[in-house]
């Protein structure tokens, strides 16, 4: 079935920006000016998900890549990583539960709650450039909350 | 304040073409989704169609090639271009702001825009 | 795509009266929908979404429940104000975004 998808911009709290670090991971540091090109373009996609009042379940890929974020155990641990699919087949409507995150608005700030492991969230460090992570508590020195833009093609 | 005004509205003959307008304040249109929904006479809500990004709008069945969505984000407005009108496009055209992205529900209505397509 | 079909299409109540609208869906919507109230040459007005939740700023004695394909909307005691048309809308099932074709609500 088709899904609804759009292109999009994510920046945390503290208005960092996404950018790509390596092939499969991205980082959160403040752009200006031109670096602002240099920012990751998400494909958002709503998927199907478990039912709830007040969660939208999305899949978020990387833009014209065969790349999407994914929820995975390393070292027992949750882990934010990104994965190449098989373009052909992506995105779909029942996306696998590792790619869901459940994206909470509230007061126009975003949350993405991993649906694989509940309370935990797409997180960034206070500190520049580091990675975009995985983590398990929220309203600590960790950031939890971004804002999306819209991306015009 | 949440607020959207639709213009552009009026008389059109049968075959001919029309865009309406939508400019909205109190919020950006660079961060909601948009939908035009659509009232003929004494009838009931019919969507149209709805835009995220520029490069990411979906219609109704119905109105896939005659109708198309746009924006402008730097003029807070909202298009409907609307080709090849009938008879039976005749209606209250209304614009309105997605709730959040990807809910699908309405939360915030122009006042509307009467579309008149006759000879 | 998915169809929304609303009953009764026209319903006679009195003030004080519980009200009850119901809508099907032509397959399952999960908990993806919502209900508007709308007024003679006014625009609709959010009323309910994610089938229960209720919208800022409306009253009470709005109620939705339902889940899959099967919805309803209840007034439990009707108000002067209330006589209106209502709608559902399908707005998770597929990429369209459907309405049903509205339940009128007037004075018996």
């Known amino acids: 079935a088709p899904v609804r998808s759009l292109n999009c911009t994510l920046r945390d709290s503290q208005q960092k920006s996404l950018v790509m670090s390596g092939p499969y991971e991205l980082k959160a540091l403040h752009l200006q000016g031109q670096d602002m090109e240099q920012q990751v373009v998400f494909s958002m996609s709503f998927v199907q998900g478990e039912e709830s009042n007040d969660k939208i379940p999305v899949a978020l890929g990387l833009k014209e890549k065969n790349l999407y974020l994914s929820c995975v155990l390393k070292d027992d641990k949750p882990t934010l990583q990104l994965e190449s699919v098989d373009p052909k087949n992506y995105p779909k409507k029942k996306m696998e539960k590792r790619f869901v995150f459940n994206k909470i608005e509230i007061n126009n700030k975003l949350e993405f709650e991993s649906a694989q492991f509940p309370n935990w969230y797409i997180s960034t460090s206070q500190a520049e450039n580091m990675p975009v992570f995985l983590g398990g508590t929220k309203g600590g020195q960790d950031i939890t909350d971004f804002t999306m833009q819209f991306v015009s093609s | 304040e949440v607020q959207l005004v639709e213009s552009g509205g009026g008389l059109v003959q049968p075959g001919g073409s029309l865009r309406l307008s939508c400019t909205v304040s109190g919020f950006s249109l660079s961060s909601y989704a948009m939908s035009w929904v659509r009232q003929a006479p004494g009838k009931g809500l019919e969507w149209i169609g709805i835009?995220?990004?520029?490069?990411?709008?979906y219609y109704a069945s119905w109105a896939k090639g005659r109708f198309t969505i746009s924006k402008d984000t730097s003029k807070n407005t909202l298009y409907l271009q609307m080709n090849s009108l009938r008879a039976e496009d005749t209606a209250v055209y209304f614009c309105?702001?997605?709730?959040?992205?990807?809910?699908?529900?309405?939360?915030?209505w122009g006042q509307g825009t009467t579309v008149t397509v006759s000879s | 795509e998915i169809v929304m079909t609303q009953s009764p299409s026209t319903l006679s109540a009195s003030v004080g009266d519980r009200v009850i609208i119901t809508c099907q869906a032509s397959?399952?919507?999960?908990?993806?929908l919502s209900w508007y109230q709308q007024k003679p040459g006014k625009a609709p007005k959010l009323l309910i979404y994610r089938a229960s939740t209720l919208a800022s700023g409306v009253p009470s004695r709005f109620s939705g429940s339902g889940s899959g394909a099967e919805f309803t909307l209840t007034i439990s005691s009707l108000q002067p104000d209330d006589f209106a048309t209502y709608y559902c809308?399908?707005?998770?099932?597929?990429?369209?975004?459907?309405f049903g074709q509205g339940t009128k609500l007037t004075v018996k």
């Open positions: 397959q399952s919507i999960d908990n993806w």
């Open positions: 835009i995220y990004d520029s490069a990411s709008t």
């Open positions: 809308q399908n707005t998770g099932g597929g990429v369209s975004i459907a």
């Open positions: 309105a702001r997605e709730r959040q992205i990807f809910s699908g529900d309405m939360d915030g």
